[in-house]
Interface confidence: medium
């Protein structure tokens, strides 16, 4: 297993007043179907609003590595393979739950945290604001 | 507080052998930036690969209700507003963590679970398989 330098201020698991605290089994069960989601399509390249994936790492968080999408272009790729600036590539965002060690370096104490990640991009018609 | 019919098989929080079990503070911290990220983007309607949101419910899970994206068309919407079947609308999927009561009816014991959800759709060039 992993050895984590233990913080002397780690909360006592038996402290009944530890705020809104529960026991969580981290043997994470994967409810995904038998198809492997990791065969993560090459949509990021084939999309008319293609994106690159950037690595975000934080050892005090689970999962420690999160991949974030960044749209490659402001516009979208047209049938000729050129960028059409009459359309917009925009990120599709989603909140994900992660676990953060709290206090830091405590092996068995975490806080649930919500973070907003960009999952991919989609091509949208722009909203045009007409100036009087 | 809440009265939950208590399962006599609930794990003991003090059981040191309970597998990979940690204390988690469920006061969910929001790490999203100071600007409020919850913009009800109308991307689902403005996208060239529009989608609808469908309800998926499971009372033993938190969150119990998850709304999933389902692409409206097989093809993508072209500049004339018609569906172009030379392109494909495909779902962008992402794994999220949810909590499941385990064993069921134990008020303070949960298991983390990963599920795959569709967040939105993107328009991609199809892969054409040529038959010899």
């Amino acid at each position: 297993g992993i050895t984590i330098p233990r913080n002397p201020g780690c909360p006592n698991s038996e402290d009944k007043n530890f705020p809104r605290t529960v026991m969580v089994n981290l043997n994470i069960h994967n409810r995904n179907t038998n198809t492997n989601p990791k065969r993560s399509s090459d949509y990021y390249n084939r999309s008319t609003s293609p994106w690159n994936l950037h690595r975000n790492e934080d050892p005090e968080r689970y999962p420690s590595v999160i991949w974030e999408a960044k749209c490659r272009h402001l516009g979208c790729i047209n049938a000729d393979g050129n960028v059409d600036y009459h359309m917009n590539s925009v990120p599709i965002q989603q909140e994900i739950l992660v676990l953060r060690r709290e206090p830091p370096h405590c092996p068995n104490s975490f806080r649930l945290e919500k973070i907003l990640v960009s999952v991919g991009c989609t091509c949208v018609t722009p909203i045009v604001h007409h100036v009087a | 507080g809440i009265t939950i019919p208590r399962n006599p098989g609930c794990p003991n929080s003090e059981d040191k052998n309970f597998p990979r079990t940690v204390m988690v503070n469920l006061n969910i911290h929001n790490r999203n930036t100071n600007t409020n990220p919850k913009r009800s983007s109308d991307y689902y309607n403005r996208s060239t690969s529009p989608w609808n949101l469908h309800r998926n419910e499971d009372p033993e899970r938190y969150p119990s209700v998850i709304w999933e994206a389902k692409c409206r068309h097989l093809g993508c919407i072209n500049a004339d507003g018609n569906v172009d079947y030379h392109m494909n609308s495909v779902p962008i999927q992402q794994e999220i963590l949810v909590l499941r009561r385990e064993p069921p009816h134990c008020p303070n014991s949960f298991r983390l679970e990963k599920i795959l959800v569709s967040v939105g759709c993107t328009c991609v060039t199809p892969i054409v398989h040529h038959v010899a």
């Epitope: 989603q94 | 939950i4 969910i28 919850k38 009800s40």
Partner: antibody, heavy 126, light 107 residues
Framework: EVQLVQSGAEVKKPGESLKISCKAS????????ISWVRQAPGQGLEWMGG????????DYAQKFQGRVTITADESTTTAYMELSGLTSDDTAVYYC???????????????????WGQGTTVTVSS | EIVLTQSPDFQSVTPKEKVTITCRAS??????LHWYQQKPDQSPKLLIK???YSTSGVPSRFSGSGSGTDFTLTINGLEAEDAGTYYC?????????FGQGTKVDIK
């Protein structure tokens, strides 16, 4: 069809306590939140507090803190709201409302009140 | 607490007319803004959630828009059965709050 059925009308004296029930049927109970909202005669809606049965969490509006207690019993799919130290200002219709507490359009723990009870009329008078 | 201010307080409208009700929040609430309709002696009914999403069973003449601090509920082609009081409601921050209500009656 989801239904929230509340207990009947109450007449109370100042200083007394009140306990109203809200029984849920036709849908999951534990996965949702139940909030309590009141409406004084001719007035608007006022959120008092709520409970998330899945975790047993409660949240109360500061105005009612210390006077209101919200509980839930999963075995009977019933939520309760108890209000103590009643005064004539507590004369109102009290509603329970279901809060889906859902993962909506990419966001966790979003809230709205999709089903409401029929209301319980409470009169506080000496 | 987040204060929601609706305008107008009262509107008297002829059938088939377009009705617009606005709701302004005292701070940015993203899109955590919902609209309810309450008819006399009835419980409130959810019409629009998250600023712009219609809920099932709600006629298509009801629509919502806005985000941040400014929101609008529109009834395109008012019908007699739409008379009642309309409330906006924010769930971005505790305590959840409601607007003071806009009463719509039919001329």
């Amino acid at each position: 069809e989801v239904q929230l059925v509340q207990s009947g009308a109450e007449v109370k004296k100042p200083g007394e306590s009140l306990k109203i029930s809200c029984k849920a049927s036709g849908g999951s109970f534990k996965g949702y939140g139940i909030s309590w909202v009141r409406q004084a005669p001719g007035q608007g809606l006022e959120w008092m507090g709520g409970i998330t049965p899945f975790f047993g969490w409660t949240d109360y509006a500061q105005k009612f803190q210390g006077r209101v207690t919200i509980t839930a019993d999963e075995s009977t799919t019933t939520a309760y709201m108890e209000l103590s130290g009643l005064t004539s200002d507590d004369t109102a219709v009290y509603y329970c409302a279901r809060d889906p507490n859902e993962f909506w359009n990419g966001y966790y723990a979003t809230h709205d009140f999709d089903y409401w009870g029929q209301g319980t009329t409470v009169t506080v008078s000496s | 607490e987040i204060v929601l201010t609706q305008s107008p307080d009262f509107q008297s409208v002829t059938p088939k007319e377009k009705v617009t009700i606005t709701c302004r929040a005292s701070q940015d609430i993203g899109s955590d803004l919902h609209w309810y309709q309450q008819k006399p002696d009835q419980s409130p009914k959810l019409l629009i959630k998250y600023a712009s999403y219609s809920t099932s069973g709600v006629p298509s003449r009801f629509s919502g828009s806005g985000s941040g601090t400014d929101f609008t509920l529109t009834i395109n082609g008012l019908e007699a059965e739409d008379a009642g009081t309309y409330y906006c409601h924010q769930t971005d921050g505790l305590p959840y709050t409601f607007g003071q209500g806009t009463k719509v009656d039919i001329k």
